[in-house]
């Protein structure tokens, strides 16, 4: 059986302030059952940016409907861009459970804001 | 065993139509994004055109954007590309692909069928 | 842009390595053409994956923004143009291609 990956294709991104900014990550299995969830930075302080599953995340949004049957994109769209959402984001893998087991994370990706042209 | 086959291309004049099909077995069709590459004579691969499994979603080099139109029928598991205004610089081996997980990784190919733009 | 040897040689039995470096992705797959127009067969996607058609003398690795192919044991057959592509789009993909001749 193949290993589980956790694909997050770009090494970084550059968008300007103001702008939304997309961060694709895709899965190669659904199994096993659990949910993916975004965070910057890694280690213990890191963030949680999206749950697809539950909590309320106004300028977060998932590109791909998460309850489509068989979906295995798992990227999110941030919008109204500012310098401090700059960071790396990693796209996370947990197995199901009480609590949820992380299971594996993307490469990561590197968001870079850029000055709102004038 | 998964199967690609394209259709037939041709010899057409600068300017002309020509739309390629590729009919696909061996994998659930409707789960996969599927993907365009051609080569020109004695050139490497270019990535033409990629379309996400619903076909709600399209993806296209700058080199063929506002005159190929990909699509697919998932009720005949076939993919199609639409080439209007040819170029002799779009004269190319067309392969159909199908793309693994993410659209820019490819995990099986057609045998291609060459399309010849000439006057 | 993805950047790769334009070719590369190897002995009969030997092992050969050809890099793919560059670009903005974090993953990697390799793609072998026998002759020009003949059809690409995958080697490797997604860094390390193999089709289960392709012969384990084939493996990939990534580390870095450096891809690696390496084939094992380098038969006459091998001799090919063998393609890189990345994750990334902004890459354009493919790289430019390299011939490995077998000696």
């Known amino acids: 059986e193949e290993e589980l990956q956790v694909i997050q294709p770009e090494k970084s991104v550059s968008v300007a302030a103001g702008d939304s900014a997309t961060l694709n990550c895709t899965v190669s299995s659904l199994i096993p059952v659990g949910p993916i969830q975004w965070f910057r930075g890694a280690g213990p302080g890191r963030e949680l940016i999206y749950n697809l599953k539950e909590g309320h995340f106004p300028r977060v949004t998932a590109v791909s409907d998460p309850t489509k049957r068989n979906n295995m994109d798992f990227s999110i769209r941030i919008s109204n861009i500012t310098p401090a959402d700059a960071g790396t984001y990693y796209c996370v893998k947990f197995r199901k459970g009480s609590p949820d087991v992380e299971l594996k994370s993307g490469a990561g990706t590197e968001l870079s804001v850029r000055a709102k042209p004038s | 065993d998964v199967q690609l086959v394209e259709s037939e291309g041709g010899v057409v004049r600068p300017g002309e139509s020509l739309r390629l099909s590729c009919e696909a077995s061996?994998?659930?069709?409707?789960?996969?994004?599927m993907t365009w590459v051609r080569q020109a004579p004695g050139e490497g691969l270019e990535w033409v055109s990629t379309?996400?499994?619903?076909?709600?979603?399209?993806y296209y080099a700058d080199s063929v954007k506002g005159r190929f139109t990909i699509s697919r029928d998932n009720s005949k598991n076939s993919l199609y590309l639409q080439m209007n205004s040819l170029r002799a610089e779009d004269t190319a081996i067309y392969y159909c692909?199908?793309?693994?997980?993410?659209?820019?990784?490819?995990?099986?190919w057609g045998l291609g069928t060459l399309v010849t733009v000439s006057s | 842009a993805l950047t790769q040897p334009a070719s590369v040689s190897a002995n009969l039995g030997g092992t050969v390595e050809i890099t793919c470096s560059g670009g903005?992705?974090?993953?990697y797959g390799w793609y072998q053409q026998k002759s020009p127009g003949s059809a690409p067969v995958t080697l490797i996607?997604?860094?390390?994956n193999r089709p289960s058609n392709i012969p384990s003398r084939f493996s990939g690795s990534t580390s870095g923004s450096t891809s690696t192919l390496t084939i094992t044991g380098v038969q006459a057959e091998d001799e090919a143009v063998y393609y890189c592509?990345?994750?990334?789009?902004?890459?354009?993909?493919f790289g430019a291609g390299t011939t490995l001749t077998v000696l």
């Open positions: 692909a199908k793309s693994w997980i993410w659209w820019t990784f490819f995990d099986y």
């Open positions: 061996g994998f659930t069709f409707r789960n996969s994004y």
């Open positions: 379309i996400s499994d619903t076909g709600d979603t399209a």
């Open positions: 903005n992705s974090n993953h």
């Open positions: 996607y997604a860094d390390t």
């Open positions: 592509g990345g994750s990334s789009t902004g890459d354009g993909i």
